[in-house]
């Protein structure tokens, strides 16, 4: 006989999560990056929302700019010059698609305290930045750009061509944007600040998906966005550098494209400064799997940019497509010509190699069964980059130090051993120099963030710790988390599992399954999260997993490249044969099965349930890719091919949720999308919409009107828990 | 509380050359980035030279070529080596940090500079 538990008062003041609790974001946690400006200083933005200058070797820190000033304005950011002379100050923000927004800017003199007047910015401005060295600015106005020599000077403007949706300079276009860059930015100072580079994106040719915006006015607006779906017109790109000394004297010099790049629809994928006169431009196929890397030289005595053949190194995939979700960026060295990149090895593994003069000769610096993930910095003495080799988890991540002045080079483990059981998965900001870095840990436990020596890896001190959220979580009762593998037909499927924290083996659970899926994507990750899965196991006793299947990342090009030009399916099959193996595990509740899945999690979760096995009872799709046809062309044919009969047509078809119409009659379809989704349009789910309806299929739907992908604001309190109602209804679970 | 001591000051002809010395004391060290400041009569108060923590140097453009600014660690004191001075020289010369500190008492009571032609 075993004493009853009911006494243990620890037990009694412990509750399960609330619904509110994830709404409210009671259980959120902090990340402190440091924003170096120089190798040992930093600035940070104080609780009271000062801005204080730190410096670590005199363990001093003082306020540059009081809350009061940035107040004055109404300021939500700043960016302090390098000469330190300056701070801009950035309010009225106004978002626009993923990473972009307009604002208004101020510049406030340091040196005496007060805002520059005269020749003040216009506004909004799409974006603004210091030069890397003075007090240079560059912005970009109504698609053009302008330049500054000083914050009160007048501005010299660089391009004349800019048009709304038509020709956009500076900024990338909305594909650009979401799928190439993927910056709000498209303009790059070189080193020293002596030239600036930037790109010109011609939109005019691109067909617009036009949507309604509701808002309050007695008719609606139509957004209209230049949106390449596959198969489409491609913006049309061009790189220009200008002297920022002396603008006018030749005025922008296009950079030309590599041969074999422009003979064909190309994309440009990005651009590193080397030095203040050599510049290194990656350039990319529409079929994107062959990328050039290509080394431009300044030749004072024409003024122009020369890229000779002989700094073209070309990256190819034959089984797939070139990079991993990008194509990986250079990293240089000091010698100013050969560089460090991660590209997959003879074993169809990510891994840093070293290219000195052609990609044929490069040196292979890491190698095994696991990826690099990324180069953080080289010095002259150490490169630091972050893999899951670790104890062979593919969901970790830590920081390692390769020491390049040294022959053989050694390999040091920063992070594997610092807080094991807290921390697995890590980032890292690194000063100048990487004299300090700072370490941010997401987890599995609480996040914490802690300031490091450069050299020796030291600690030096504690940044965010989280007590608050730490104490706040001692009486809550947190479900219990795995991550396994499952070994199927030579493939491993990794998952995460998240049990009720009275998780009985014994006992029969429901299931939900959350998917996201996407090509070069990883769902289970060692990271720590209170979220709506949390609470629907701890409250409401579910059992929720996470499954990396084909097609997902970090686990070799075998497991990557499967989906190739296949969309839809592997996908999905790794998604059943999990929920199969589950089942055998004893402790899951085959009557009560769902599924469910956003964006491309929501493509597969309607595949899913539309897959005809009879596995799941409901499922949701939060703004789903229905046809591939529909969405945008970077992306889908990265992995599709294109939609013609001579390339991919007949899988683009065969790939689509409406074709399946049939197969949701046996299962409880919730479908759910934005009106004003300017990513995946809103004619994804009513294309699905039409077919159920048309099959005469039952199923339930729910819109939210003016929102975009991200479904913020109150729309995610109705949004999640509509789906937890759903969800407990297709469960018998009592409200 | 940081205090700041400037010297060096003084009246000079036109195209000679003063040295300003900044001592910093207090909560404070002249190893973070410095700057030295000035300020005309009637004129506001602006940034001269800078020197960071590494070391490196960044000059107005007025005073490009003819001023230097360095720092004596052991001695927590900041120099300004004018030559070559000009009339338009002529102001009070402070040194803070770089960016400067705000708030009460942090700038010191400077020193004056005077070039007559």
């Known amino acids: 006989l075993r004493p009853s538990r009911v006494h243990n008062s620890e037990e009694n003041t412990m509750r399960a999560l609330t619904l509110k609790d994830i709404l409210n974001g009671t259980f959120s946690y902090k990340t402190f990056f440091p924003n170096w400006i120089s190798g040992q200083e930093y600035l940070h933005q104080s609780a009271d929302n000062n801005i204080v200058l730190y410096n670590i070797e005199t363990g001093q820190s003082y306020t540059i700019l009081s809350n009061r000033t940035m107040k004055s304005v109404n300021a939500s950011n700043y960016g302090l010059s390098p000469d330190r002379q300056f701070v801009y100050l950035e309010s009225d923000y106004s978002k626009l698609w993923r990473y972009s927004y307009t604002a208004t800017y101020y510049i406030y003199d340091l040196s005496n305290g007060e805002f520059v007047r005269g020749n003040e910015l216009p506004r909004p401005i799409q974006y603004l930045c210091w030069s890397p060295v003075g007090s240079k600015l560059a912005y970009v106005y109504q698609n053009n750009i302008y330049l500054k020599q000083r914050p009160g000077d007048p501005p010299f403007q660089i391009t004349f061509n800019g048009r709304e949706n038509k020709i956009f300079n500076g900024i990338p276009d909305w594909v650009y944007e979401e799928e190439m860059l993927p910056t709000k930015y498209a303009l790059w100072w070189s080193p020293n600040g002596k030239f600036l580079a930037y790109a010109e994106f011609n939109d005019k040719d691109i067909p617009v998906i036009a949507y309604s915006y509701y808002g309050d006015e007695q008719y609606p607006r139509t957004i209209n966005i230049p949106y390449p779906k596959a198969g489409a017109k491609n913006p049309v790109v061009r790189i220009f550098i200008i002297d920022t000394t002396y603008p006018a004297y030749v005025g922008p010099q296009e950079v030309p494209v590599p041969a074999m790049i422009a003979s064909s629809d190309y994309y440009f994928s990005w651009l590193t400064w080397v030095t203040d006169e050599r510049v290194c431009l990656q350039w990319l196929k529409r079929v994107q799997n062959v990328s050039v890397l290509s080394i431009c030289d300044f030749r004072e005595d024409w003024q122009t940019w020369d890229c000779p053949k002989t700094q073209e190194h070309i990256e190819e995939s034959r089984t797939g497509w070139a990079g991993g979700f990008f194509v990986s960026r250079p990293v240089f060295s000091y010698d100013a010509i050969s560089y460090y990149k991660i590209f997959s090895d003879k074993d169809g593994y990510k891994h840093i190699h070293y290219i000195k003069d052609t990609v044929e000769n490069a040196i292979q610096i890491t190698s095994g069964k696991w990826e690099a993930i990324n180069i953080f910095r080289v010095t002259q003495d150490s490169l630091f980059y972050s893999s899951n080799e670790f104890e062979e988890y593919p969901g970790r991540r830590n920081i390692y130090r390769i020491s390049i002045g040294s022959y053989p080079p050694s390999k040091k483990c920063v992070t594997c051993h610092l807080r094991k059981e807290r921390c697995q998965y890590y980032t890292a900001s690194f000063s100048d120099y990487a004299k300090y870095y700072a370490l941010v840990c997401y987890g599995p436990g609480i996040p914490i963030s802690t300031l490091h020596d450069g050299r020796t890896d030291q600690e030096i001190k504690i940044l965010e710790e989280n007590k608050e959220l730490e104490n706040a979580l001692k009486n809550i009762q947190l479900p219990k988390e795995e991550i396994k593998k499952l070994e199927v037909d030579e493939i491993t499927l990794w998952y995460k599992m998240i049990l009720p924290p009275q998780f009985d083996r014994s006992k029969k659970y429901p299931l939900l399954i959350q998917v996201y899926g996407g090509p070069c994507s990883q769902s289970v990750r060692s990271v720590f999260a209170v979220n709506w899965i949390s609470y629907l196991a701890s409250k409401e006793g579910m059992v929720i997993a996470l499954v990396d299947g084909r097609g997902t990342a970090f686990q070799g090009d075998k497991l990557l490249y499967a989906v190739y030009r296949k969309l839809g399916v592997y996908e999905v099959e790794d998604q059943i044969t999990a929920v199969r193996k589950f089942i055998e595990m004893g402790f899951i509740d085959e009557k009560r099965i769902a599924i469910w899945g956003w964006s491309y999690g929501g493509y597969v979760s309607s595949l899913a349930l539309a897959s005809g096995t009879g596995l799941f009872k409901c499922g949701i799709a939060v703004a789903p890719v229905s046809s591939w046809e529909y969405y945008a062309s970077v992306y889908t044919e990265r992995f599709m091919g294109l939609p013609t009969k001579d390339d991919n047509l007949e899988h683009y078809k065969n790939s689509t949720v409406m074709a399946r119409a049939e197969y949701f009659r046996n299962v409880d379809y919730l479908l759910i999308h934005g009106t004003a989704d300017d990513n995946v349009h809103f004619q994804n789910s009513a294309q699905i919409a039409k077919a159920l309806v048309n099959a005469q299929v039952d199923f339930q739907a729910m819109w939210y009107s003016d929102q975009n992908h991200g479904l913020s604001g109150l729309s995610t309190n109705h949004l999640y828990t509509h789906m937890t109602h759903f969800l407990k209804q297709c469960f018998s679970l009592s409200d | 509380q940081v205090q700041l001591q400037e010297s060096g000051g003084g009246l000079v002809q036109a195209g000679g050359s003063l040295r300003l010395s900044c001592v910093v004391s207090?909560?404070?060290?002249?190893?973070?980035?410095m700057a030295w400041y000035r300020q005309a009569l009637g004129k506001e108060r602006v940034w001269v030279a800078g020197?960071?923590?590494?070391?490196?140097?960044n000059y107005a453009d007025a005073v490009k070529g003819r001023f230097t600014i360095s720092r004596d660690n052991d001695k927590n004191t900041v120099y300004l080596q004018m030559n070559s001075l000009k009339p338009e020289d002529t102001a009070v010369y402070y040194c803070?940090?770089?960016?400067?500190?705000?708030?009460?008492?942090?700038w010191g009571q400077g020193t004056q500079v005077t070039v007559s032609s």
């Open positions: 803070n940090a770089w960016p400067p500190r705000i708030g009460l008492g942090s």
């Open positions: 020197i960071i923590s590494d070391g490196s140097t």
């Open positions: 207090g909560s404070f060290d002249s190893r973070n980035a």
